[in-house]
Interface confidence: low
Amino acid sequence: YDFTNCDFEKIKAAYLSTISKDLITYMSGTKSTEFNNTVSCSNRPHCLTEIQSLTFNPTAGCASLAKEMFAMKTKAALAIWCPGYSETQINATQAMKKARKSKVTTNKCLEQVSQLQGLWRRFNRPLLKQQ
């Protein structure tokens, strides 16, 4: 999916109002210095591409993010503010309806969500130069 035509300010508002808090809740009990933020993005469409990948792609070490509250709110924001996004996600949504929520938060998941926090912060400051 090409995120170029999303309403970035509306997505930013959704992040600031709810998604950011859900990410913090997920990471509660983890030191903010525990993980280096290495995952990067160069502009807002690229940030959303990476955010989608880390949030919804199944991974070898962390498979349970898609059913987390921040993930469901992320999906809702993208569906509402990115034209045509929901159509591209129909198959994925049907798969998710079958999915059982994993009760275990693995360390790999914590690392992954830490990277997501970095991507979202970068998304909110698109004019900053890359380090």
Partner: antibody, heavy 121, light 112 residues
Framework: EVQLVESGGGLVQPGGSLRLSCAAS????????MTWVRQAPGKGLEWVSS????????YYADSVKGRFTISRDNAKNSLSLQMNSLRAEDTAVYYC??????????????WGQGVLVTVSS | DIVMTQTPLSLSVTPGEPASISCRSS???????????LHWYLQKPGQSPQLLIY???HRASGVPDRFSGSGSDTDFTLKISRVEAEDVGVYYC?????????FGGGTKVEIK
């Protein structure tokens, strides 16, 4: 163009050391987990080691645990494999690959050309 | 460790004919998220392996639609609907459900 280029292979005596390097280009290196896979002459593929994008988690095959060390430098887009106490059975072509955890269920979607390591006296 | 077993060891196919390779795992590759962590690779003669299929049935970028993957739990199949000369090589399955990640022993496909 997405590319992985390995270097550092060669002939080494049993018990010796070698350091393999992998230079990545054409993609945001720090956004991907990386994996080393090897292939002994005329044999199949064997997973060696994986490292997550932030180096927070590292995994090794039992056959190399305690002898090999995987590392990465995201600032330099490079992956390394330090191989110590080498044995004849470590003789193989070593492939640097992208994946092993973060995308597409851990499948390895980009492979380098491979570098030959020969352990012999 | 999860053991991956491929059959047959080798396969000789007439161009235009179908081909099928089986891969069996010693335990289920189905995760509680409903994804199954089984992938297929092709190593052409003298080349590095390349990803063909990921997560059982998803074709990797640039892979022709004559390749398809299917299966579930512990039994998986790679099918080539019409074999072409460029399809020769060794096919490997791999599991990434848990470390150590493991590959099948490979199936060599050649043209008759």
């Amino acid at each position: 163009e997405v590319q992985l280029v390995e270097s550092g292979g060669g002939l080494v005596q049993p018990g010796g050391s070698l350091r393999l390097s992998c230079a990545a280009s054409g993609f945001t290196f720090s956004n991907y987990d990386m994996t080393w896979v090897r292939q002994a002459p005329g044999k199949g593929l064997e997973w060696v080691s994986s490292i997550t994008f932030a180096s927070s988690y590292i995994y090794y095959a039992d056959s190399v645990k305690g002898r090999f060390t995987i590392s990465r430098d995201n600032a330099k887009n490079s992956l390394s494999l330090q191989m110590n106490s080498l044995r004849a059975e470590d003789t193989a072509v070593y492939y640097c690959t992208r994946g092993g955890g973060a995308y597409y269920g851990g499948s390895l979607d980009v492979w380098g050309q491979g570098v030959l390591v020969t352990v012999s006296s | 460790d999860i053991v991956m077993t491929q059959t047959p060891l080798s396969l000789s196919v007439t161009p235009g004919e179908p081909a099928s390779i089986s891969c069996r795992s010693s335990q289920s590759l189905l995760h509680s998220n409903e994804y199954t962590y089984l992938h297929w690779y092709l190593q052409k003669p003298g080349q590095s392996p390349q990803l063909l299929i990921y997560l059982v049935s998803h074709r990797a970028s640039g892979v022709p639609d004559r390749f398809s993957g299917s299966g579930s739990d512990t039994d998986f199949t790679l099918k080539i609907s019409r074999v072409e000369a460029e399809d020769v090589g060794v096919y490997y399955c791999e599991q990434t459900l848990q470390t150590p990640f493991t590959f099948g022993g490979g199936t060599k496909v050649e043209i008759k």
